[in-house]
């Protein structure tokens, strides 16, 4: 049943669910700071547009009575609990800044008719794709699968002359929330990635991964995994790796590769890192003092969620349109708005578009260098370094299947 | 976090979750009547044992603010919501008469540390197996798989001389809650049924089912489905059926086959019905006036849940043992107690044992007749009719794979 909204003449509120379970282990104060910084910006923008309205956030905290707290694995019902709390308190805003956990978001759409817009800093899983009132401000799994398929198929670059159609995927179940859903999407038999590959095998044990590195009978030279370099090192250590192995390390929300004085450790030489273009964002922001490089994206997504709310509010108010309508609820998509750190584009399904960056380790400088970028909005790969100083033979990526001649 | 319990000197309460979403579309008044009838009996039994204590039930209703109501598909969080309500109201009893929906029960165990006993009239799915504080009073899916495997392997009865190792399973997603989980268990690749079969295929479309009935190239003669005769008729109609096809219709909670003057329709001649021995229970009970044959088992499970609570209370009080201990929470298993309709046995995992009954349609009398019974407690099949008047050739069940000779 519907919840009455605090969203009427001159007073507009965004309800921010402050979850015990979160996609990133971020103190709730930091999230609150990000939201408040966003509100300051929104107020200024509305005032400049001659819109004398009040904009606030109501923070709805879990009471912690029931749920196992911590990560997203036990978050399924927390979003619904908070929605009930909002409902009882009659404090629903115009927009819900909702759960970051996929389970929680999915359950909210499964169990209720959400007729107001929901913005999420997370909800990475395929099960949250194509929700008509959901906007996701951190790259969802679907976007990753599109990049990988595009890259696998690419065969006309100086450094990649073979199409690939095979892959191993390493997934041991201890991954962070973003990685968990990214790898789930690669594993899922219904996903675009699985659909486009002729061979794919999920490696679940450390030993399976370690054995593949030198296995002459391996079915693919390419291994996709998700995490940071430390995660890879714990798994791979200093083991020898066959020369035509390529590890794709997905580490989207980690700016450390772009920091000054970062040197790539030797174990990264067979690795291509997939990450995102960093902004300088938050480096000198009032609320970002305590944020690690991996946390910036999460806080930024909350801040941008508030700016998106402000953008939509401004657009509708300027057009004299009602905010509490299905039109408003379905409008948070297929648009570009000014985010905290530059333009933010949402696709037709309300999912953020971004520039993904594929890095390699230069054997000369031991630095991470940009090999290519990929624009998720137009599904297009743009080579950057046409003569990379790779570890691989002839400075080209190997074929995904080694030709071993007659057996 | 734990919830304080109304369960101390002289006053003992059972918290009954009254869910909007339920495994059977049973008016909540009927459930309440069953619980109250059970309480009357418990009070009498305790009094007779010289235990002057107060026993009550607190009924916890959903507020209906959030959830899509109705069936179990959108029930995941409703149990947790009610647990929160209990927690806030400080009204937790000694025992929880919990959700009947698998999703809801599973989620409660996933998201919380349930250190008090929970009794369920349902929770049929494999995902609710082996929960240390859960008792299920209606046959769970695991018990069905044990029967089927036992029956498939049986080859030493006058009417079944072939072991079977193949099966089709018809599952179109519109099934009732019990059927949904029974068929899920048969479909699951990890289940005992799947493990023991060499061939199994799930038919999801009506047309697939209909085509198999006369398909010369079918891989099995056996089709398992779940529902009542009407459900089968809608699907099969009066279509011709190959003579060696055997349909197993699982319809555990339906006493109509045993009612006087019931004649089996012609379309049931190729069908074996798996159901349970009916008791006379409820037929002349004060609260059963409005119950259909299919609803009796559900109401009876609630009533028996109360009697089980009373039995455990009596046992612990007579032994001078504390009720609010882990020992009490883990004690609702591996026992037999006096239920409303006779002894009720719970296995080592707190799941009810029962006598399943396999019926066939007599070609002479057009009546449903008992072919065999199966005791889930000892996993044993007991033939009843050694000379059944089957439709199948030589009054024997055919092989599951037709020998078509040289092709």
């Amino acid at each position: 049943s519907q919840v009455s909204q605090n969203c009427h003449n001159g007073s507009y509120e965004i309800s921010v669910l402050m979850m015990d379970n979160s996609a990133f282990a971020e103190p709730l104060e930091n999230v609150e700071d990000a939201v408040n910084e966003g509100l300051e910006i929104v107020r200024g923008r509305l005032q400049n547009a001659g819109l004398n309205v009040t904009v606030n956030a109501s923070f709805m905290y879990s009471d912690g009575l029931i749920h196992n707290s911590g990560d997203c694995r036990s978050s399924t019902c927390e979003g619904l609990d908070l929605l009930r709390k909002i409902s009882n308190a009659k404090r629903m805003g115009c927009v819900l800044m909702g759960p970051s956990c996929t389970y929680s978001t999915f359950q909210m759409y499964l169990d209720t008719e959400l007729s107001y817009p929901m913005i999420s800093a997370g909800s990475f899983g395929l099960s949250c794709d194509y929700k008509e009132t959901l906007t996701r401000l951190m790259s969802p799994a679907r976007k990753l699968t599109y990049f990988l398929v595009n890259f696998w198929k690419t065969n006309d670059l100086p450094f990649k002359t073979y199409s690939w159609s095979t892959s191993y995927v390493y997934k041991n179940g201890t991954e962070s929330e973003d990685c968990f859903w990214y790898l789930n999407a690669l594993e899922a038999s219904v996903s675009y990635f699985s659909h486009e590959l002729s061979f794919k095998l999920v490696l679940r044990q450390d030993k399976e991964f370690q054995d593949i590195l030198m296995d002459h009978n391996r079915k693919s030279n390419v291994i996709v995994m998700c995490g940071d370099p430390q995660f890879l090192y714990k798994l791979k250590g200093d083991r020898a790796v066959a020369e035509d192995i390529v590890i794709i390390l997905v580490d989207l929300f980690n700016d450390q590769y772009f920091e000054d004085n970062v040197t790539a450790p030797d174990y990264m030489k067979n690795v291509l890192v997939l990450t995102q273009s960093p902004g300088n964002s938050l480096l000198n922001s009032s609320f970002s003092r305590n944020l690690s490089p991996t946390k910036r994206d999460f806080a930024l997504a909350y801040l941008n969620g508030i700016l998106l709310f402000g953008h939509m509010l401004k657009t509708f108010l300027e057009n004299g349109e009602n905010i509490t309508t299905p039109k408003f609820a379905h409008a948070f998509r297929n648009l570009t708005f000014e985010g905290y750190d530059g333009p933010v584009t949402l696709d037709d399904w309300g999912d953020v578009d971004s520039t993904m960056v594929l890095l390699y380790t230069s054997v000369d400088t031991k630095k991470y260098k940009v090999l290519l970028t990929y624009d998720t909005h137009v599904n297009q790969t743009n080579p950057v370094d046409m003569s990379p100083t790779f570890t691989w033979k002839n400075s080209k990526l190997p074929n995904d299947i080694t030709d071993r001649g007659p057996q | 976090s734990q919830v304080s319990q109304n369960c101390h000197n002289g006053s003992y309460e059972i918290s009954v979750l009254m869910m909007d979403n339920s495994a059977f579309a049973e008016p909540l008044e009927n459930v309440e009547d069953a619980v109250n009838e059970g309480l009357e009996i418990v009070r009498g039994r305790l009094q007779n044992a010289g235990l002057n204590v107060t026993v009550n039930a607190s009924f916890m209703y959903s507020d209906g603010l959030i959830h899509n109501s109705g069936d179990c598909r959108s029930s995941t969080c409703e149990g947790l919501d009610l647990l929160r309500k209990i927690s806030n109201a400080k009204r937790m009893g000694c025992v929880l008469m919990g959700p009947s929906c698998t999703y809801s029960t599973f989620q409660m165990y996933l998201d919380t540390e349930l250190s008090y006993p929970m009794i369920s009239a349902g929770s049929f799915g494999l995902s609710c197996d082996y929960k240390e504080t859960l008792t299920r009073l209606m046959s769970p899916a695991r018990k069905l798989t044990y029967f089927l495997v036992n029956f498939w392997k049986t080859n030493d009865l006058p009417f079944k001389t072939y072991s079977w190792s193949t099966s089709y399973v018809y599952k179109n997603g519109t099934e009732s809650e019990d059927c949904f989980w029974y068929l899920n268990a048969l479909e699951a690749s990890v289940s005992y049924f799947s493990h023991e079969l060499s061939f199994k295929l799930v038919l999801r479309q009506d047309k697939e089912f209909q085509d198999i009935l006369m398909d010369h190239n079918r891989k099995s003669n056996v089709i398992v489905m779940c529902g009542d005769p009407q459900f089968l008729y809608k699907l099969k109609g009066d279509r011709a059926v190959a003579e060696d096809i055997v349909i197993i219709l699982v319809d555990l909670f339906n006493d109509q086959y045993f009612e006087d003057n019931v004649t089996a329709p012609d379309y049931m001649k190729n069908v074996l019905v798996l159901t349970q021995s009916p008791g006379n229970s409820l037929l002349n009970s004060s609260f059963s006036r409005n119950l259909s044959p299919t609803k009796r088992d559900f109401a009876l499970a609630y009533l028996n849940g109360i009697l089980l609570f009373g039995h455990m209370l009596k046992t612990f009080l007579e032994n001078g043992e504390n009720i609010t201990t882990p020992k009490f929470a883990h004690a609702f298993r591996n026992l037999t107690f006096e239920g409303y309709d006779g002894p009720v046995t719970l296995d080592d995992w707190g799941d009810v044992d029962s006598t399943m009954v396999l019926l066939y349609t007599s070609v002479d009398t057009k009546k449903y007749k008992v072919l065999l019974t199966y005791d889930t407690h000892v996993n044993q099949t007991n033939p009843v009719d050694m000379s059944p008047t089957f439709t199948w050739k030589n009054s024997k069940l055919p092989n599951d794979i037709t020998d078509r000779g040289p092709q």
Partner: antibody
Framework: QVQLVESGGGLVKPGGSLRLSCAAS????????MNWVRQAPGKGLEWVSV???????HYADSVKGRFTISRHNSKNTLYLQMNSLRAEDTAVYYC????????????WGQGTTVTVSS | QSGLTQPPSTSGSPGQSVTISCTGT?????????VSWYQQHPGKAPKLLIY???KRPSGVPDRFSGSKSGNTASLTVSGLQDEDEADYYC??????????FGGGTKLTVL
């Protein structure tokens, strides 16, 4: 009231450097994206660079690698460091505030003139 | 990024209406609802007249209106007044974080 005041322009030789400043007042400077736009004598407007609230920077292709935009939020000041100046960089340089809607500059300074000539 | 195309000049008598066009591509004007128009009097800084294709900042007379069709945006000035004589520039967001200006149109009030 809300205003922007540019300074730092002047005459400089090709290859030289110059640093422009833009002092903001009357609004919460840190909340806005800030831009530099230039106008060569007798010509149209040309966007040069932007710095967003979060500190992210972007440049027109014509100045990429030579110009650096920065901001000092506590001093309410925007900067443009111009290196390797060329004759074609001669223009009036305006500092402009982003209105929060992409590509809309609602407050402009009066401009400061940069002349690159030997 | 090449600029947007505007007519170099146009004119009209007081009280008349004039329309200035601004033609871009499917990557800028056609792709985004972010076209702005600026007015610049000689020796002065530009002033924002229209943003987001059709929106007017407070203080801008409703004689100024914006529209867009396909890859072309338009500024219409109705009820021309002497003080409307100025240069008019369009600009469009062009993806990434880049924006492009038009070459400008000189409006003369006859």
């Amino acid at each position: 009231q809300v205003q922007l005041v540019e300074s730092g322009g002047g005459l400089v030789k090709p290859g030289g450097s110059l640093r422009l400043s833009c002092a903001a007042s009357g609004f919460t400077f840190s909340s806005y994206s800030m831009n530099w736009v230039r106008q060569a004598p007798g010509k149209g407007l040309e966007w040069v660079s932007v710095i967003y609230s979060g500190g992210s920077t972007h440049y027109a292709d014509s100045v990429k690698g030579r110009f650096t935009i920065s901001r000092h939020n506590s001093k309410n000041t925007l900067y443009l460091q111009m290196n390797s100046l060329r004759a074609e960089d001669t223009a009036v340089y305006y500092c402009a505030r982003g209105a929060g809607t992409l590509n809309a500059f609602d407050i402009w300074g009066q401009g400061t003139t940069v002349t690159v000539s030997s | 990024q090449s600029g947007l195309t505007q007519p170099p000049s146009t004119s009209g008598s007081p009280g008349q209406s004039v329309t200035i066009s601004c033609t871009g591509t499917s990557s800028d004007v056609g792709a985004y609802s972010y076209v702005s128009w600026y007015q610049q009097h000689p020796g002065k800084a530009p002033k924002l007249l229209i943003y987001a294709v059709t929106k007017r900042p407070s203080g801008v007379p409703d004689r100024f209106s914006g529209s867009k069709s396909g890859n072309t945006a338009s500024l219409t000035v109705s009820g021309l007044q002497d003080e409307d004589e100025a240069d008019y520039y369009c600009s469009s967001f062009a993806g990434g974080s880049t924006l492009v200006f038009g070459g400008g149109t000189k409006l003369t009030v006859l």
